[in-house]
Interface confidence: medium
């Protein structure tokens, strides 16, 4: 015998309360597939979350984060506070990267500068809190009298080209 619920399309549910007829999902709920016996509650983008896509009867709402925060987790399940470049988020808030580490984004942790010597290279540009070192040719390749280290380049937003 065919399940009467299998006829219920997305946006409806097979309603126990009405002898298993297909009823539309109530407001603020959805069913993304047919044959569902219940609709799911729409996600609410509240507080630091903001609505990227409204909920419809057939699809859930999608959230992202308000300015000053960024998404974490599958489907932006959490919003985490942004820090400045050169900082990382700790339990006590945004803290500057320790010497020898950098963070070139508004999120994530401070990471150690690259150890150029592991690759047999020299430091071409010193690291900063916001930037990794730039490794250059090996010391043997440098011409006599040339300075081996350049001061750090001014920090800039990742993905932007220099002015």
């Amino acid at each position: 015998l065919q399940d009467p619920c299998s006829n219920c399309p997305a946006g409806t549910f097979c309603d126990n309360n009405r002898n298993q007829i297909c009823s539309p999902c109530p407001p603020n709920s959805f069913s993304s597939a047919g044959g569902q016996r219940t609709c799911d509650i729409c996600r609410q983008c509240k507080g630091v979350f903001r609505t990227r896509k409204e909920c419809s009867s057939t699809s859930n709402a999608e959230c992202d984060c308000t300015p000053g925060f960024h998404c974490l987790g599958a489907g932006c399940s959490m919003c985490e506070q942004d820090c400045k470049q050169g900082q990382e988020l700790t339990k006590k808030g945004c803290k500057d990267c320790c010497f020898g580490t950098f963070n070139d984004q508004k999120r994530g942790i401070c990471r150690p500068w690259t150890n150029c010597s592991l690759d047999g290279k020299s430091v071409l540009v010193n690291g900063t809190k916001e930037r990794d070192v730039v490794c250059g040719p090996s010391p043997a390749d440098l011409s006599p009298g040339a300075s081996s280290v350049t001061p750090p380049a001014p920090a800039r937003e990742p993905g932007h080209s220099p002015q």
């Epitope: 126990n16 109530p26 603020n28 016996r37 509650i41």
Partner: antibody, heavy 119, light 107 residues
Framework: QVQLVQSGAEVKKPGASVKVSCKAS????????INWVKQAPGQGLEWIGN????????NYNQKFKDKATITADKSTSTAYMELSSLRSEDTAVYYC????????????WGQGTTVTVSS | DIQMTQSPSSLSASVGDRVTITCRPS??????LNWYQQKPDKTVKLLIY???RLRSGVPSRFSGSGSGTDFTFTISSLQPEDIATYFC?????????FGQGTKLEIK
Amino acid sequence: QVQLVQSGAEVKKPGASVKVSCKASGYTFTSYWINWVKQAPGQGLEWIGNIYPSDSYTNYNQKFKDKATITADKSTSTAYMELSSLRSEDTAVYYCTRDYGSAYSFHPWGQGTTVTVSS
Amino acid sequence: DIQMTQSPSSLSASVGDRVTITCRPSQDISNYLNWYQQKPDKTVKLLIYYTSRLRSGVPSRFSGSGSGTDFTFTISSLQPEDIATYFCQQGDTLPYTFGQGTKLEIK
């Protein structure tokens, strides 16, 4: 916010009837089922029945079929449950609660109405 | 009607303890299992719906799991404000039925 406010406590004599009201606010009254639940003193919860205010479609627990009548007034966003031929075993707290919209769960709940049947 | 067997009927635990309540329906109810909290002042709140989904605004120390005929409700770290009676409820089949409740007290 979504709220259900029930009428006050009632004391009735055996054989009488009582009508408990449940006023809804903060949402579209006609779009969600209203359920009624009984809790006798020191006991658990029992589902009595429900109503869909848009078309007054009702379901009843067979146990309460001859005891309870559930109605709704769309114009005032109020659901009612009338209990007839009252007996001492009808003494209980009666709750109205809205369908949450998923998995046949109930939220929010009214504050409850105490009905005491005593001669 | 589907019978809901909830256990234990009462329990006493200390603040910070992990608390577990079980609910066993008399027949398979898929995931149509919901959990409620009734405070001593008789106010009732939905905590978890569809076995494991936390209602918006409910603290994450509450969780649920299971399927079919075996369900569990857990409070990961008991807080003083969790003193209440907890009920399970099946939404699979009319008439909807509740467990008998678990009264939770603080030691």
